[in-house]
Interface confidence: low
């Protein structure tokens, strides 16, 4: 009898194929699309998740326009190139040899170019602002209760260290969650804020990436918190490089 569980699945990533071929006959899972072995005790990187999603493509979602210096994911879904650690490669290209540079969450941070485009390094997204609008409720949520519940969610569901949840702001009906994580702050084993934000985004949209868990049931003192709009802004350690035409558009 080996150490493999009867139910060989990946709790943190349903977009995997699993078999008991790991050490000691243990359950080991590989991401769809890339075939990379994933660590099912923590979140799978956004790059591998996007690649898996593209291996079973769905309709691309429409995303909002950027606001000021923050980046918003306008380009929707694409099939990314991931490095051996599952991170986004700094340069991404499509099948027609159009290339662009991305940040650590895979969002484009330069104008599109050709194969001669250089992306010297993967620029880290160190600040993520998740902007939510909740559905009308009888009254406003208590700010401190809301703050505690969202911090608990990121700690327990996404295993994000509490120190990376910088702030939770609330002005009914708008909730803003600030995630901050500099390169120097992120230790080995720490969940990346970009990955946590992506899992949260998918949870909010009712597209949970977790295996077999129910969808996200967010409650504040028993009152359901239902989100009707989500915007996510990404701020990089090095400002993005877009042409003036793009910035004034």
């Amino acid at each position: 009898h080996t150490a493999a569980q009867d139910n060989c699945t990946c709790p943190t990533n349903k977009m995997t194929v699993c078999s008991p071929d790991g050490p000691g006959g243990r359950c080991q899972c590989r991401a769809l699309g890339s075939g990379m072995a994933v660590d099912c005790s923590t979140l799978t990187s956004k790059c591998l998740l996007l690649k898996a999603r593209m291996s079973a493509p769905k309709n691309a979602r429409t995303l909002v326009r950027p606001s000021e210096h923050a980046l918003v994911d306008n380009d929707g879904l694409y099939d990314p190139d991931c490095d051996p650690e599952g991170r986004f490669k700094a340069r991404q290209c499509n099948q027609t040899s159009v290339c662009w540079c991305v940040n650590s969450v895979g969002v484009r941070r330069t104008d599109k170019g050709d194969l001669s485009l250089r992306c010297d390094e993967l620029v880290r997204t160190h600040h993520i602002l998740i902007d939510l609008r909740h559905r009308p409720t009888a009254g406003a949520f208590n700010h401190s209760d809301l703050d505690a519940e969202l911090r608990r969610l990121f700690r327990e569901r996404y295993r994000l260290h509490p120190k990376f949840v910088a702030a939770v702001h609330y002005e009914q009906p708008t909730i803003q969650i600030e995630l901050r994580q500099n390169t120097s702050q992120k230790a080995a084993g720490d969940v990346d804020i970009g990955d946590a934000a992506y899992y949260f985004e998918r949870d909010i949209k009712g597209e949970s990436l977790f295996q077999g868990r129910g969808g996200l049931d967010l409650r504040v003192r028993g009152e359901p918190l239902q989100v009707e709009r989500t915007l996510i802004y990404y701020l990089d350690e090095i400002p993005p490089k877009f042409s003036m035409k793009r910035l004034t558009a």
Epitope: A3, Q5, P11, G22, P23, G24, C27, Q28, A37, A188
Partner: antibody, heavy 119, light 112 residues
């Protein structure tokens, strides 16, 4: 929050069967495995066995002939039985939750229960 | 079965000084697929259950002070306490989970 609590008789006679129960709360036994570990007084930790979330078990090869671990998911309980006990089985017995689907670490432990084997 | 050997058995270190505990496994604990080492470190104080400090050989559990760090790969691993505090007096255990589970014999850390 996640909690585990061991319970059972504190005194067992030699040659009899030691029976302990680990009652859990804050998580589902269909999602996480539960391990039994023991520690003789003044000595180190010894892993006894595991009840995986899928319902299968594995045991320490040195104890395999005497150990049975079972689960009652409706009661949120995992039970340990150790037969033909001797004084060498006197120990604090702990249950601990697997924090990973393939059993990489134990982040949550019960407080432990001391079992003495003596006539 | 995988055998885990810890050294030293006990260690006396002055407050503020570095404490280093070694753990050696009888076979490699590195999973080439996930590139993770199946090794954890625990701290146990008298009358208490063990507390998880480090998993995957070098990942610090949430809430564990950053003076605790784990390193190593394959068969040789180290737990380091960079600046020993009075509350760090305890017994430390390594544990493999590459093939089921085995604990090391423990290292008692005391203040010199």
């Amino acid at each position: 929050q996640v909690q585990l609590q061991e319970s059972g008789p504190g005194l067992v006679k030699p040659s009899e069967t030691l029976s302990l129960t680990c009652t859990v709360s804050g998580f589902s036994l269909t999602s996480y495995g539960v391990n039994w570990i023991r520690q003789p007084p003044g000595k180190g930790l010894e892993w006894i066995g595991v009840m995986w979330a899928g319902g299968s078990t594995n045991y320490n090869s040195a104890l395999m002939s005497r150990v049975t671990i079972s689960v009652d998911t409706s009661k949120n309980q995992v039970s340990l039985k150790l037969s033909s006990v001797t004084a060498a089985d006197t120990a604090v017995y702990y249950c601990a939750r697997d924090e990973n689907w393939d059993g990489a670490w134990f982040a949550y432990w019960g407080q432990g229960t001391l079992v003495t084997v003596s006539s | 079965d995988i055998v885990m050997t810890q050294s030293p058995d006990s260690l006396a270190v002055s407050l503020g000084e570095r404490a280093t505990i070694n753990c050696k496994s009888s076979q490699s604990l590195l999973n080439s697929g996930t590139r993770k080492n199946y090794l954890a470190w625990y701290q146990q104080k008298p009358g208490q259950p063990p507390k998880l400090l480090i998993y995957w050989a070098s990942s610090r559990e949430s809430g564990v002070p950053d003076r605790f760090s784990g390193s190593g790969s394959g068969t040789d691993f180290t737990l380091t306490i960079s600046s020993l505090q009075a509350e760090d007096v305890a017994v430390y255990y390594c544990k493999q989970s590459y093939n089921l589970f085995t604990f090391g014999g423990g290292t008692k850390v005391e203040i010199k």
